[in-house]
């Protein structure tokens, strides 16, 4: 689709005569009829296949034609066409005299023709005007012409339709040849594909508008090049999405089990020594004078039972003081004024004289201690039970009552959930913090590998010599159906060639 444009510039008819030679009265009021048609080697009358146009009266005798309009007409004249421009044409321009105001052909006398020119040739689509001048015996016509494409049509013959757009169906303007020129930020055949943020990962990122980088599931970061670790992963990283590879010192499915609590948290106070003792667990060894899980509390000086021989300890602002029982004296009631004659040993203790009877020593029965056997042995004072176990005095010995999940003399052993072999069919058991997990062998599934999943025993093609293989689903074994001439569990022996047995 395009327009053939004809710009009339000057018409010369100095004598003011018609084609017949007869003069116009009072002068030749001139208008033009234009016929555009397909190329003809000899331009002949007939239908104006490409279109016609007429002008109003443009002047009398000789005149120059102004650009744009004159008397309501248009200059250049427009001859639109709705087909591919063929590149060739024929053009007939007739100058007519209008005695009156009616310019219709049927209203004019046949001899009102002033002049007629006919040209034909090649014409490429373009913006440049071709200037031409045609002269007859009495008249001269100067004009120029060109073919341009209609809006949204492009190419050498105005056959390429291209309409700029900026919507869901495309984001482009049109080049002179009708090819699309994408707007900034868009690409693709129809400029529908946004150009993502520079560096946006090709596989893990995408965009719906230019300079955007939206991440696909499992990826994050400005350029979608960082994987998202497993939900709940605390001290771990990933190289592919949903992984949780633990940092050093951390363990467990979510890397939330502290294997190096001492380093990560420094829980022990007052110069105590910290020892890691399992997942999220530690032990503080207190310096003398401190107590508590983290050695965070000072011991009162009386807590170390400094008073001997049944002396009672009293805390004071500046230390402690021992109140000694009768027969004893000294800072810690360590000196005796008694002898064995005073029967100083309690609870069945036996007395032994020392230093020629100036002193004595008590030998205590089991369960009693102290210089006078006055103290019942509390075998739980050292708090020997680990993992929150309760220490119980049982006569001459002690025992630990363990919390659920622990065992051993001192509750030092974690009861393994795997100890009772819960995984069926040879499954491998793994102890987890909150239970266990079974890794099942091929052919089994379920939390405890209790579900048999059938194996295709024929998958490994065990039968030879084109034998047909059948799977026995009840035993997960195979059976080979041998072709004629072969025997054996796998049809591996030809008939007549018995296998060589070693006996």
């Amino acid at each position: 689709s395009g327009v053939f444009q004809l710009q009339l510039q000057e018409f010369i008819n100095e004598r003011g005569v018609l084609a017949s030679g007869r003069p116009c009265e009072p002068g030749c009021r001139t208008f033009f009829r234009v016929c555009l048609k397909h190329f003809q080697a000899v331009v002949s009358p007939g239908p104006c296949t490409f279109g016609t146009v007429s002008t109003p009266v443009l002047g009398t005798n000789s005149f120059a034609v102004r650009d744009d309009s004159s008397g309501g007409g248009r200059n250049p004249l427009q001859l639109p066409f709705n087909f591919t421009w063929p590149g060739t044409f024929s053009l007939i321009i007739e100058a007519w005299h209008a005695p009156g105001d009616d310019l219709r052909p049927e209203a004019l006398p046949p001899d009102a023709l002033i002049s007629k020119i006919a040209i034909q040739g090649s014409l490429a689509v373009g913006q440049n005007w071709l200037l031409d001048e045609q002269t007859s015996t009495l008249t001269r016509l100067r004009y120029s012409y060109r073919v341009i494409c209609s809006d949204n049509y492009y190419g050498d013959n105005c056959s390429r339709l291209c309409k700029k757009r900026n919507d869901h169906f495309g984001h482009y303007v049109c080049q002179p040849d009708g090819n699309l020129s994408c707007l900034p930020g868009w690409t693709g055949e129809y400029c529908q594909q946004p150009i993502c943020l520079s560096g946006c990962h090709e596989q893990n990122g995408y965009c719906s508008k230019p300079a955007e980088c939206l991440c696909r599931p499992g990826w994050q970061g400005r350029l979608c090049n960082e994987c998202i670790p497993h939900n709940g992963c605390r001290h771990g990283t990933c190289s592919t999405p949903w992984q949780c590879t633990c940092d050093e010192g951390w363990g467990g499915l979510f890397c939330d089990q502290d294997l190096n609590y001492c380093t990560h948290h420094s829980p022990c106070k007052n110069g105590a020594t910290c020892s890691n003792s399992g997942q999220r667990s530690y032990t503080c060894t207190c310096r003398p004078g401190y107590t508590g899980v983290d050695c965070e509390l000072e011991l009162s000086e009386c807590d170390s039972n400094p008073c001997r021989n049944g002396g009672s300890c009293k805390d004071q602002e500046d230390g402690y003081h021992c109140l000694c029982p009768p027969g004893y004296y000294g800072l810690h009631c360590e000196h005796s004024t008694l002898s064995c004659a005073d029967s100083p040993c309690f609870n069945g203790g036996s007395c032994r004289e020392r230093n020629q009877g100036a002193n004595y020593a008590c030998e205590c029965p089991p369960n009693f201690t102290g210089s006078n056997c006055e103290k019942k042995v509390d075998r739980c004072t050292s708090n020997p039970c680990a993992n929150g176990g309760q220490c119980l005095n049982r006569g001459p010995s002690r025992m630990c009552r363990c919390r659920p999940g622990f065992t051993g003399t001192y509750c030092e052993l974690h009861v393994s959930d795997c100890a009772r072999n819960p995984c069926a069919h040879g499954g491998t058991c793994h102890d987890l913090e909150n239970g266990l997990m079974c890794t099942c062998p091929a052919g089994f599934s379920g939390r405890r590998c209790e579900v048999r999943t059938s194996i295709d025993a024929c998958a490994s093609s065990p039968c030879f010599n084109r034998a047909t293989c059948y799977t026995d689903l009840s035993t997960d074994t195979f059976v080979c159906n041998c072709p004629y001439g072969f025997v054996g569990s796998r049809c591996e022996f030809p008939v007549g060639l018995p296998p060589s047995f070693p006996w």
Partner: antibody
Framework: QITLKESGPGLVKPSQTLSLTCAVS??????????WSWIRQHPGKGLEWIGY???????YYNPSLKSRVIILVDTSKTQFSLKLSSVNAADTAVYYC???????????WGQGTMVTVSS | ETTLTQSPGTLSLFPGERATLSCRAS???????LAWYQQKPGQAPRLLIY???SRATGIPDRFSGSGSVTDSTLTISSLEPEDFAVYYC?????????FGQGTKLEIK
């Protein structure tokens, strides 16, 4: 916002074991830096510290009650519990659970639960 | 154990007056490990001061604490009606952790 709430029977018979639970809601329970304590208050009297437990399960008890006390932690349910054995009338009190961060200044307390020891 | 003795046992004052509550330890305790609590009838204690002089979150600045290794003081600069309650001191320097017997602050 962390809250603590004690629960358990309000009446226990002498010589039996008193059992209370403290439910912790909020996000600090799994932190290793807190001491989770039990404290009691005899009617019309002052406060007595019973003992504490850490998230790791390690405990420390008041020496005067040590032989009768067990404190346990259940991290999966974010709660800790008190068991006091061989109770007598002197164990009648309001029992509080409390949190202490780093040191033993108790910044968050439960509302308390009254336990009466009586036959 | 470390015994904390609070004085006076009861303190009667008018709103607007200054209150000074004392706490004495039977043996030296680090002043960094002393706390004060307020308790109203039927309620749990509320932490006011820790580390001898640091105010807990949300505690008005009329409450202040000071002290040495055996003597600590809680001061309420100008009493408000809601300040009348029982106040306890606590030491957490030595084992076992202990509390004072309390000072009852009542409206005169």
């Amino acid at each position: 916002q962390i809250t603590l709430k004690e629960s358990g029977p309000g009446l226990v018979k002498p010589s039996q074991t008193l059992s209370l639970t403290c439910a912790v809601s909020g996000d600090s329970f799994s932190s290793g830096n807190y001491y989770w304590s039990w404290i009691r208050q005899h009617p019309g009297k002052g406060l007595e510290w019973i003992g504490y437990i850490k998230y790791t399960g390690s405990t420390y008890y008041n020496p005067s009650l040590k032989s009768r006390v067990i404190i346990l932690v259940d991290t999966s349910k974010t709660q800790f519990s008190l068991k006091l054995s061989s109770v007598n009338a002197a164990d009648t009190a309001v029992y509080y659970c409390a949190r202490a961060p780093g040191t033993h200044a108790f910044d968050v307390w439960g509302q308390g639960t009254m336990v009466t020891v009586s036959s | 154990e470390t015994t904390l003795t609070q004085s006076p046992g009861t303190l009667s004052l008018f709103p607007g007056e200054r209150a000074t509550l004392s706490c004495r330890a039977s043996q030296s305790v680090s002043s960094s490990y002393l706390a004060w609590y307020q308790q109203k009838p039927g309620q749990a204690p509320r932490l006011l001061i820790y580390g001898a002089s640091s105010r807990a979150t949300g505690i008005p600045d009329r409450f202040s604490g000071s002290g040495s290794v055996t003597d600590s003081t809680l001061t309420i600069s100008s009493l408000e009606p809601e300040d009348f309650a029982v106040y306890y001191c606590q030491q957490y320097s030595r084992s076992p952790i202990t509390f004072g017997q309390g000072t009852k602050l009542e409206i005169k």
